[in-house]
């Protein structure tokens, strides 16, 4: 159940895909990854106001209970709904290898 | 990849399963659910310090970038890793029906 995509907080303030440029040093990968030297990391950032992109029934419950007691139950959180694969060229004992990671780059976001 | 389960913030402070008691009224379900009158909602609450229960590579990246740019990249968030099903007895036009919801109660938690 993918609920409303209208952000009541204003354009770009709610849960959505963002791109953050990061070097191998930023990621702590310099010692085991050869390429790419820089990664365009796609991640899910933004607020999850009431029923915005609610992933499922659990998210809807969380919204209801957060409204009742914000200090007890946190608001839903903006997280990946799916991922894009990414290939890294890694250093190995014998040279290099290509490794595909399926859970590295967010493709789509929702609130849960 | 399920990283460390040791919480550096102290017992019970990090991402874990909590139970919150909620009535149908609390959940806004009183008009369409007959039973149960009260739900023991299991949900994931708590902090996600560095590499604690990191769900995948994306969570590890998020941790690294949050440390570098806390204003830009949020810390990983405590969300359900899996769910337990729950049966609700619902009101219908003709009487009642039993409906199983697979995404209502959190079973296990991780950080993403």
């Amino acid at each position: 159940a993918r609920n409303g995509d209208h952000c009541p907080l204003g354009p770009g303030r709610c849960c959505r895909l963002h791109t953050v440029r990061a070097s191998l040093e930023d990621l702590g990968w310099a010692d085991w990854v050869l390429s790419p030297r820089e990664v365009q990391v796609t991640m899910c950032i933004g607020a999850c106001p009431s029923q915005f992109r609610a992933a499922n029934m659990h998210a809807q419950i969380k919204t209801s209970l957060h409204r009742l007691k914000p200090d007890t139950v946190p608001a839903p959180c903006c997280v990946p709904a799916s991922y894009n694969p990414m290939v890294l060229i890694q250093k190995t004992d014998t040279g290099v290898s290509l490794q595909t990671y399926d859970d590295l780059l967010a493709k789509d976001c929702h609130c849960i | 990849a399920r990283n460390g389960d040791h919480c550096p913030l102290g017992p019970g402070r990090c991402c874990r399963l909590h139970t919150v008691r909620a009535s149908l009224e609390d959940l806004g379900w009183a008009d369409w659910v007959l039973s149960p009158r009260e739900v023991q909602v299991t949900m994931c609450i708590g902090a996600c310090p560095s590499q604690f229960r990191a769900a995948n590579m994306h969570a590890q990246i998020k941790t690294s970038l949050h440390r570098l740019k806390p204003d830009t990249v949020p810390a990983p968030c405590c969300v359900p890793a899996s769910y337990n099903p729950m049966v609700l007895i619902q009101k219908t036009d003709t009487g009642v029906s039993l409906q199983t919801y697979d995404d209502l109660l959190a079973k296990d938690c991780h950080c993403i």
Epitope: L9, A47, K69, P70, D71, P74 | P74
Partner: antibody
Framework: QITLKESGPTLVKPTQTLTLTCTFS??????????VSWIRQPPGKGLEWLAH???????RYNPTLKSRLTITKDPSKNQVVLTMTNMDPVDTATYYC??????????WGQGTLVTVSS | DIVLTQSPSFLSASVGDRVTITCKAS??????VAWFQQKPGKSPKALIY???YRYSGVPDRFTGSGSGTEFTLTISSLQPEDFAAYFC?????????FGGGTKLEIK
Amino acid sequence: QITLKESGPTLVKPTQTLTLTCTFSGFSLSTSGMGVSWIRQPPGKGLEWLAHIYWDDDKRYNPTLKSRLTITKDPSKNQVVLTMTNMDPVDTATYYCARSSYGAMDYWGQGTLVTVSS
Amino acid sequence: DIVLTQSPSFLSASVGDRVTITCKASQNVGTNVAWFQQKPGKSPKALIYSASYRYSGVPDRFTGSGSGTEFTLTISSLQPEDFAAYFCQQYNNFPYTFGGGTKLEIK
């Protein structure tokens, strides 16, 4: 129409206990999402939240004052009572009660000025 | 405790002006922020809840925005009755905390 009104002594002596009553109408404190908070404001100063009681009798207190505060409710009388022990001249303030609906304090009483002096 | 830093503390403006008051939280409070107006000798009046929602009866010249740690209250065209003190408040965590207030005065 939602209204709240604070009542209690206007003058208390140091070390005494203050008891304030908030009498409200227009809503039920038995309804999910409802609560009542107490807030105070020393003359010419800002607002300080003191205590909160939820519809389900769950209570919260300001940690700096927790040992001195007690909040209770009587939904049948539409009242919330705050007691504050060991009063001191620095506790001189206008004390407000406010309705909380889903966390947000939407209706406030007119306030009652409490002076602590010997 | 979450500290709300409100700025400016004092603001002089004229009728018809557009003014903005900011409120910064020491940690993420989501959208659980309210704004209040208080006139001398009166109790606070609720203007905005959930960071951006106006209460019924509040003129649409009052606009709230923000989420996380940065929030603003904007009055688009000041009216004589708007000169008062304004407070932000967070209700995401106990203890609930208020900003120090902004006193809006006629220039």
